[in-house]
């Protein structure tokens, strides 16, 4: 429980959160992620916007890039070369999709304090990075990859076939960026910079989504994106590796695809360098329940990459799809052949396994009715990972160390008891060889970032403790938050409830369900946040609940894979079940219950409103999916299979929002979407609106011109104001 403060320490009066507090970001917290440059050195941007160097062991610190230098080219980001001779300064940031953006890059010589003018980089660049050693540069410009041996050298062009919306080299196309790689890049340097691996995506045959971008001109522009919807033609991917020492000699060499993968449609899912001459590629069948990890070796004599069948490791799911949201990536040992990987154990929980020869002989090194979530680092004697084991709360993240050296394997929770009440949700950032690490705590109390010794785990210093925020919140009445569980028919439904500051169990309160509910998501987390729903609980006296139902993550495969091939059924049922349980608690006004969600949450909230239960008075869907035939192939087919008659077309048709249009008659529905949504296309809401109109069902709607899936900026303020008015009207709360 997070206590509500009704009086500050001096006994003065306090105030509730306001909508303006939320819209203006008055109560935002800070985190501190060191930009590690060695085992004991890191860079960080100071409050004055200088880039400052820190040495943990000597205590030395100095500015390596002044704010003035950054400002001289309007830079908003930087990257230091590993040899510390140069830095790139990034300016003219122009967002594209979720991760991708273009920018202008200036190379600054740290030795003489001057910008390099010889062979300047073209603009705008789609991606740029230093080699892991020295100061070679690889970059992508107009869908082609270029290499510079030194920043002042002329570039060597690696690929020539790049074409906008057709062939992508070194960067992903839309679907790979959003649904597979989750990065803006698709090129990878080998550990010492000898080789450069890259992906080529051929989108020639992919159908194009086209939508208007209204802008300020007389005629709107049309945005065209090759975007494979469920069942459509997919990108064709190839992986190449080039020797960067003598790139002109042999040129790029293609890495072969495992035969069992190449026999039908497939995806490339990730690339991990093991050594300069060994690389690990992961592939996935289009029907995403079979993944193959392939370890490939460089053959000097032939200048080719060889991927022996004996080094192919198959991961297959018989109960759902392979992996969690993504197939996990391997973390290799120092022997450069064995590795650690998270996958389902025989009880259906995701755990860390050690694979030495075959997956069948894998040694399971974590086990229990909880899940290992991330492997942060493996050293000679330790493995650091996060899990939700501690005290059986799935929404926690603690950091553990397994000792793997010359003594018996032992497991220690590094974070569980550090700041037990304040911190139960951590991530970590490790320096080279895990000599030091930063722990970043996200809650449930105020976030705090600390620096630790990698051998003793001793705290060295606090990096950021959000003191100003703590002081600012002293006179704010925050909602009480509790995380509990409901046991219903052999299913555990974890929920987070936010209660108004002066909550009285004998009174009746309106209830708002905030839902996401997508496969492998988690909403009930022990994290600190002050957002729109905090305001609704604090100022408007609304009880807020978030529920993790079937399909959500980190509680085992039974819960996760329950929704396999049946999206839109159990997620909705479980929200409804939870609402009924909340009503039984006695403090909910059952005539004032609402549900809202964004994206997948908009889909679930729409289906819940149209469930015919009579539980919900009103609800809001922001940027909802309305039919799985409209959404991206990689995501949709992972969970639903193909929209074909001999696969799962029937459920594709049964699970649309439009099919339930009639059921919206007895609820108040607010439908919201950005017209320039590249992700969940405006088409989804257009089809809901059309079905409601055709059924002569009244509803409210709002579109946001030229806004994407996030509806940011001024539109965001308008959106939350609009939703607030709608909810207050629904709950009969005075404005």
């Amino acid at each position: 429980l997070r206590p509500s403060r009704v009086h500050d320490s001096e006994g003065g009066t306090t105030r509730a959160l306001t909508l303006e507090d939320i819209l203006n970001g008055t109560f935002t917290y800070k985190t501190f992620f060191p930009n590690w440059i060695s085992g004991q050195e890191y860079l960080h941007q100071s409050t004055d916007n200088d880039i400052v160097y820190y040495n943990i062991e000597t205590g030395e610190s100095y500015t390596i890039l002044s704010n003035a230098t950054m400002k001289s080219v309007n830079a908003s980001n930087y990257g230091l070369s590993p040899d510390r001779q140069f830095a790139y300064l990034e300016s003219d940031y122009s967002k594209l999709w979720r991760y991708s953006y273009t920018a202008t890059y200036h190379i600054y010589n740290l030795n003489n304090g001057e910008f390099i003018r010889r062979n300047e980089l073209p603009r705008p660049i789609q991606y740029l990075c230093w080699s892991p050693v020295g100061s070679k540069l690889a970059y992508v410009y107009q869908n082609n990859i270029y290499l510079k041996q030194r920043p002042e050298d002329p570039p060597f062009q690696i690929t020539y076939n790049g074409r906008e919306n057709k062939i992508f080299n070194g960067i992903p196309d839309w679907v790979y960026e959003e649904e597979m790689l989750a990065t803006k890049h698709a090129l990878w340097w080998s550990p010492n910079g000898k080789f450069l691996a890259y992906a080529e995506f051929n989108d020639t045959e992919i159908p194009v989504i086209a939508y208007s971008y209204y802008g300020d001109e007389q005629y709107p522009r049309t945005i065209n994106i090759p975007y494979p919807k469920a069942g459509a033609k997919n990108p064709v991917v190839r992986i190449f590796i080039i020797d960067t020492t003598y790139p002109q000699q042999t040129g790029p060499r293609e890495v072969p695809v495992p035969a069992m993968i190449a026999s039908s449609d497939y995806y490339f899912s990730w690339l991990t360098w093991v050594t300069d001459e060994r690389v690990c590629l992961q592939w996935l069948k289009r029907i995403q329940n079979v993944s193959v990890l392939s370890i490939c070796d460089f053959r000097e004599g032939w200048q080719t990459w060889d991927c022996p069948k004996a080094q192919e490791h198959i991961e297959e799911s018989r109960t759902g799809w392979a992996g969690g949201f993504f197939v996990s990536t391997p973390v290799f040992s120092y022997d450069a052949i064995s590795y650690y990987k998270i996958f389902s154990d025989k009880d259906g929980y995701k755990h860390i396994h050690y694979i030495k020869d075959t997956v069948e002989n894998a040694i399971q090194i974590t086990s229990g009715k909880w899940e290992a979530i991330n492997i942060f680092r493996v050293t000679q004697d330790s493995l650091f990972y996060s899990s939700n084991e501690f005290e059986d709360y799935p929404g926690r993240r603690n950091i553990y160390r397994i000792s793997i050296g010359s003594s018996p394997p032992s497991k220690k929770c590094i974070t569980c008891h550090l700041r037990k009440e304040r911190c139960q949700y951590y991530t970590a950032s490790f320096s080279d060889y895990a000599k030091y690490y930063a722990l970043i705590c996200y809650g449930p109390g105020l976030p705090i970032s600390t620096l630790h010794d990698g051998h003793t785990d001793q705290e060295i210093k606090i990096l950021e403790e959000n003191k100003e925020l703590e002081n600012a919140l002293k006179n704010i009445q925050l909602p009480k938050e509790e995380i509990k569980k409901l046991e219903v028919d052999d299913i555990t439904l974890w929920y987070k409830m936010m209660l108004p500051p002066r909550f009285d169990r004998s009174k009746k309160y309106p209830l708002l369900i905030q839902v996401y509910g997508g496969p492998c998501s988690q909403s009930v987390k022990s994290v600190f946040s002050i957002n729109w729903i905090s305001y609704l609980a604090s100022k408007e006296g609304i009880v807020i609940a978030l529920v993790d139902g079937r399909g959500t993550a980190y509680q085992g495969d039974k819960l996760l894979y329950a929704v396999y091939r049946k999206l839109g059924v159990y997620e909705v049922e479980d929200q409804i079940t939870a609402v009924r349980k909340f009503i039984e608690m006695g403090f909910i006004d059952e005539k004032r219950i609402a549900i809202w969600g964004w994206s997948y949450g908009g889909y679930v909230s729409s289906l819940a409103l149209a469930s015919g239960t009579g539980l919900f008075k009103c609800g809001i869907a922001v940027a909802p999916v309305s039919s799985w035939e409209y959404y991206a192939s990689i995501y949709t087919e992972r969970f639903m299979g193909l929209p074909t008659k001999n696969d799962n077309l029937e459920h594709y048709k049964n699970s649309t929002v439009m099919a339930r249009a009639e059921y919206f008659r007895n609820v108040d529905y607010l439908l919201i979407h950005g017209t320039a949504d590249d992700n969940v296309h405006f088409q989804n809401s257009a089809q809901i609106a059309k079905a409601l109109v055709n059924a002569q069902v009244d509803f409210q709607a709002m579109w946001y011109s030229d806004q994407n899936h996030g509806i940011p900026g001024l539109s965001s303020k308008h959106l939350y104001t609009r939703m607030t008015h709608f909810l207050k009207q629904c709950f009969s709360l005075s404005d």
Epitope: S338, D345, Y354, K356, I363, Q364, I365, S367, I402, I404, S406, S407, P408, P409, S410, K411, K412
Partner: antibody, heavy 121, light 107 residues
Framework: QVQLQQPGAELVKPGASVKLSCKAS????????LHWVKQRPGQGLEWIGE????????NFSEKFEIKATLTVDSSSNTAFMQLSRLTSEDSAVYYC??????????????WGAGTTVTVSS | QIVLTQSPALMSASPGEKVTMTCTAS?????MYWYQQKPRSSPKPWIF???NLASGVPARFSGRGSGTSFSLTISSMEAEDAATYYC??????????FGSGTKLEIK
């Protein structure tokens, strides 16, 4: 194949000492640590101690620190445990066992057949 | 030192029956190991690192648990499974401690 050979039985008088042997075959004794385990008739397993044959380092359970002495003769690929000042409480089967300490194993993979020590006057 | 308590001390099961025995540690341990011992024989490694089967152990056996509570399960009892099973742990080593054993008989 890998084996640990132990003599079947030893009959000793109270107050005397006995030196039990454990001969390794199929591998070099210095490659793995050797542990000794006691089992009284109808009872459970009790760890006595271990020796690292490569350097002679050893660890004991507190209870056996005075009672047991562990040595290795690498030339004969044999480990020894000497038990001193024997009493009827020391009557038991004594096993030598090899520790597989390869990554993430850490279990006793090879066991001798055990030597039954009977302390009786 | 950490004390391991096994329960039950003695149990019997019919062929095909599911069998579960437990091992409780007096304080939290990282991993549990199990050994099988038949009369007049040396112990054999059975389960290591809580949940991994040693070489040659039938797949009907499984191990699980964490903290202070661990178990060994046989999904479908067979005659050859009749034996005494010992749990063992390394936390706080030295010393190593074993449980007192669970004797499993066939009905």
């Amino acid at each position: 194949q890998v084996q640990l050979q132990q003599p079947g039985a030893e009959l000793v008088k109270p107050g005397a000492s006995v030196k039990l042997s454990c001969k390794a075959s199929g591998y070099t004794i210095t490659s793995y640590s050797l542990h000794w385990v006691k089992q009284r008739p109808g009872q459970g397993l009790e760890w006595i101690g271990e020796i690292n044959p490569a350097n002679g380092d050893h660890n004991f359970s507190e209870k056996f620190e005075i009672k047991a002495t562990l040595t290795v003769d690498s030339s004969s690929n044999t480990a020894f445990m000497q038990l001193s000042r024997l009493t009827s409480e020391d009557s038991a089967v004594y096993y030598c066992t090899r520790l597989d300490d390869s990554r993430f194993h850490w279990y006793f993979d090879v066991w001798g057949a055990g030597t039954t020590v009977t302390v009786s006057s | 030192q950490i004390v391991l308590t096994q329960s039950p001390a003695l149990m019997s099961a019919s062929p095909g029956e599911k069998v579960t025995m437990t091992c409780t540690a007096s304080s939290s341990v990282s991993y549990m190991y199990w050994y099988q011992q038949k009369p007049r024989s040396s112990p054999k490694p059975w389960i290591f690192l809580t949940s991994n089967l040693a070489s040659g152990v039938p797949a009907r056996f499984s191990g699980r648990g964490s903290g202070t509570s661990f178990s060994l399960t046989i999904s479908s009892m067979e005659a050859e499974d009749a034996a005494t099973y010992y749990c063992q742990q390394w936390s706080g080593y030295p010393p190593i401690t074993f449980g007192s054993g669970t004797k499993l008989e066939i009905k």
